[in-house]
């Protein structure tokens, strides 16, 4: 009968979430192991219900209005390991009446963000938890830290200060927390990181302050364990000094002020003048560090939203474990990596939306490169063999350049075009917005792509055999916004094609599809068919799953193939109520409205239906 | 099926005290509250407390607070009530009923005569 | 302690009659309200807890409602098996507290 009560009851938890309870309901199973009353309306917390349940582990107090603590509240529940008080009122003076939350000896998780909690106040609030593990203080209105702040928490492992307004944190804040090893202080008033001495830390997230330096401690026996550091949505004009962090695997600078610099060093101790654009680049580690290489071990750096114009070689010369490397948004006008051996491990490289104009890429640089992202960039003559030469390249995007495909090994084309041919590993191409002219018979062979996109290149000329070598590979077809009359492309040949989108040309033919294919999705939306004989879409009928044709100046006889679809239900015709066929007296009507005997009387027999 | 069985009805001495034991059986039984409930001949149902036999941690009704004891024994999923400093008026039947929202099976009742 | 008054203390009615009993308490006890049905020489038996909802096992013409402080037990048609002694009572806050009873005969 229990599951007619206002609380659900499994095995031993309990969940009573948002039933407008007032106060700790009085009988629930008394081996109760999991209370979760969050999203109530209770206002105090008192020894009696709340200590009925002594077999607690787990009490879930958030979101409700609790503004008073009764002294000892939680005292009789000995076996409490996780508390919630999220989202209440504990700032209310009440809360805090002889001594706060009181000792919580086997508490290892405490959530206490939403409270409105500001710094004196929550040195009273905390008391004695010497097993707690992960404390959280998100979203309340601390503005300092204090060594006061955190005592008789030896066991804190994860602090989370998100969302508060700290400006200060006092040196040794910290101190009492000898092991902790994620630190959570984004979206905080911070700007300045001068002496960061947390050896025992590994993730630390600084993202969205007003940081304008960090700086860690000058010791030089010092072995810092940090391995994720985020410091996007800062104010850092340069590229931190990280030399003393020779772990750190996950780097986010992204949104900040950076520039690299575009010399060397001016002097050789390794401080460097921020005029210059450096604040100690990770070039040399420092003399006392074993790891010999800062950076070395980084295998994600993220650098969008800069404002860096040039990349130094020996910048990218000790990052020989990166995998994942974002620099969009910036200002770069060339980028090169040259070297044999440069960026070996680097997966993915991100340079979208940067004022590109140069790209060399060396014969046996970026080796593992498999997704190279250059969108919205102002490439036009590159080498030939640019892209031909990434061993492991799988996925491009050229979207908005200027780049000019050459033609296969018989046809190369013009001076300053683009090999796409031979290019063995590359599965995805974006040629979008290229004002590219003509694509050259040959301008793929051998290279097996699954998916091409040559949308928005208007004027195009598709020349015939410009797509010959795709037809046992390609299986995403984008042709959209491209003025095409005419089609010179065999689609009946691609035998794995599975999307095809040809809207926004002005089409009036497709090729007949007689036999059997893997055509799933076709889009012809705004384009000039007015039919579709069944003879030349026979062959989608068994695969065929959606089909977009609005904005076509349908003829309401003849098209029995498409009735029948529209009748079957078995193809996903877009917007059926409103697909509009014409009469030959150019009367408009609901395709799907059509009967046979509408095409009869005026003489026009329907040979479909 | 879920089941309460009570031990025999007693005759006692006033001032002396009586222990009556409640056996559970066909459930969880620390997954529920046992009560006891105390009612005098022709009179209404008095609750007396009840016990978490998990932890057994007892509330008491203020009035009968000195006078009984609450007990669980685990083991052998058996609740006990010991009333002390026996007087005419303890004279009734006790019930043991097991219950969270509500008390959903009652033991047959022990009659407890006090009597000199 | 909260108090339950039960009216009537006694009730004469038929079989096929629709009987009300009320039990007010002397605070609001936010719904946690049990009925129970006692026949003579036999054990309470649970009725209807959390206000309406019925136990396993109890006719459906035995109905709860209420809220706040006023609540009432609802018998739609009087059945022979139904002349006995009910009480409320709430569970809301300890102690829990029984009403007076209220006893139902035979017109």
């Known amino acids: 009968h229990q599951d007619k009560v206002p609380c659900k009851m499994v095995d031993k938890k309990v969940s009573c979430q948002v039933l407008g309870l007032l106060q700790v309901p009085s009988v629930l199973p008394p081996d109760t192991e999991t209370l979760d009353l969050s999203g109530n309306q209770l206002r105090s917390i008192l020894a009696s219900p709340l200590g009925f349940y002594t077999a607690l582990r787990h009490l879930d107090l958030s979101t409700n209005e609790i503004s008073f603590l009764q002294p000892g509240a939680f005292q009789a529940l000995t076996h409490l390991e996780h508390l919630s008080l999220a989202h209440n009122r504990l700032a209310m003076a009440t809360a805090l009446s002889a001594g706060g939350l009181g000792p919580l000896p086997r508490v290892t998780s405490l959530d206490l963000s939403g409270n409105s909690l500001y710094s004196g106040l929550l040195e009273r609030l905390l008391g004695e938890a010497p097993s707690l593990h992960t404390l959280s203080l998100a979203e309340n209105s601390l503005t300092r830290l204090t060594r006061h702040t955190f005592r008789d928490m030896p066991a804190l492992e994860q602090l989370d200060l998100h969302s508060n307004v700290l400006m200060d944190i006092e040196d040794g804040a910290f101190e009492g927390l000898p092991r902790l090893t994620h630190l959570n202080l984004s979206r905080n008033s911070l700007t300045c990181i001068s002496d960061f001495s947390l050896q025992q830390l590994r993730v630390l997230d600084l993202s969205c302050n007003s940081i304008e330096a960090f700086q860690t401690a000058s010791q030089p026996q010092a072995e810092f364990q940090l391995t994720w550091l985020d410091l996007r949505e800062n104010k850092l004009l340069h590229f931190p000094d990280l030399a003393a962090l020779p772990r750190l695997i996950y780097l986010n600078l992204s949104n900040n002020l950076i520039r690299l610099p575009t010399g060397p060093p001016q002097d050789s101790k390794g401080i460097h003048a921020p005029s210059e654009g450096w604040s100690a680049l990770p070039l040399s580690a420092p003399s006392g560090n074993a790891s010999g290489r800062p950076l070395s071990q980084l295998l994600n750096l993220d650098l969008s939203y800069n404002e860096i114009e040039l990349i130094p070689d020996s910048f990218l010369e000790h990052l020989t474990s990166l995998c994942f490397l974002n620099l969009s948004r910036n200002c770069l006008r060339t980028f090169e990596a040259r070297r044999l051996g440069s960026l070996p491990c680097l997966m993915l490289l991100d340079l979208s939306h940067n004022a590109l104009e140069t790209l060399e890429l060396g014969a046996r640089a970026l080796g593992s490169l498999r997704t190279l992202l250059l969108q919205g960039n102002a490439l036009r003559d590159l080498p030939p063999y640019t892209f031909a030469n990434l061993a492991s390249l799988q996925r491009l995007n050229l979207q908005g350049n200027r780049v000019s495909p050459c033609g296969g090994p018989d046809e190369p084309g013009p001076s300053g075009c683009v090999a796409f041919s031979g290019i063995t590993s590359l599965r995805s191409l974006s040629l979008v917005d290229n004002e590219i002219e003509l694509l050259r018979a040959g301008a793929f062979l051998h290279t097996p792509l699954t998916e091409l996109d040559l949308s928005s290149n208007p004027g195009l000329e598709v020349a015939t055999g410009a797509l010959g070598g795709l037809e046992a590979s390609l299986e995403v077809l984008a042709l959209q916004g491209n003025g095409l009359m005419v089609l010179q492309v065999d689609l009946p040949c691609f035998i794995c094609l599975k999307r095809l989108n040809l809207a926004e040309n002005r089409l009036s033919h497709l090729p007949a599809w007689t036999q059997a294919v893997s055509l799933e999705v076709l889009d012809l939306r705004n384009n000039s068919f007015s039919l579709l004989p069944g003879s030349a879409m026979g062959g989608l009928e068994t695969s065929l799953r959606r089909l977009y044709l609005q904005g076509n100046p349908l003829s309401c006889c003849g098209n029995g193939w498409l009735a029948a679809q529209l009748h079957q239900g078995r193809v996903d015709v877009d917007a059926t109520q409103d697909l509009i066929c014409r009469f030959s007296s150019q009367e408009e009507v609901s395709l799907s409205h059509v009967r046979p005997e509408d095409c009869e009387k005026g003489g026009l027999k329907n040979i479909n239906l | 099926q879920v089941q309460l069985v009570q031990s025999g009805a007693e005759v006692k001495k006033p001032g002396s005290s009586v222990k009556v034991s409640c056996k559970a059986s066909g459930y969880i039984f620390t997954s529920y509250w046992m009560h006891w409930v105390k009612q005098a001949p022709g009179q209404g149902l008095e609750w007396i407390g009840r016990i978490a036999p998990n932890s057994g941690g007892a509330h008491y009704h203020e009035k009968f607070k000195t006078k009984v004891t609450i007990t669980a024994d685990k083991s052998t999923s058996t609740a006990y009530m010991e009333f002390s400093s026996l007087r005419s008026e303890d004279t009734a039947v006790y019930y043991c009923?097991?219950?969270?929202?509500?008390?959903?099976?009652w033991g047959q009742g022990t009659a407890v005569t006090v009597s000199s | 302690d909260i108090q339950m008054t039960q009216s009537p203390s006694s009730l004469s009615a038929s079989v096929g009659d629709r009987v009300t009993i009320t039990c007010r308490a002397s605070q609001d006890i936010s719904n946690y309200l049990n009925w129970y049905q006692q026949k003579p020489g036999g054990a309470p038996e649970l009725l209807i807890y959390y206000t309406s909802t019925l136990h396993s096992g109890v006719p459906s013409r035995f109905s709860g409602s209420g809220s706040g402080t006023d609540y009432t037990l609802t018998i739609s048609s009087l059945q022979p098996e139904d002349f006995a002694t009910y009480f409320c009572q709430q569970v809301n806050t300890l102690p829990f507290t029984f009403g007076s009873g209220t006893k139902l005969e035979i017109k």
């Open positions: 009923a097991r219950g969270n929202y509500g008390m959903d099976y």
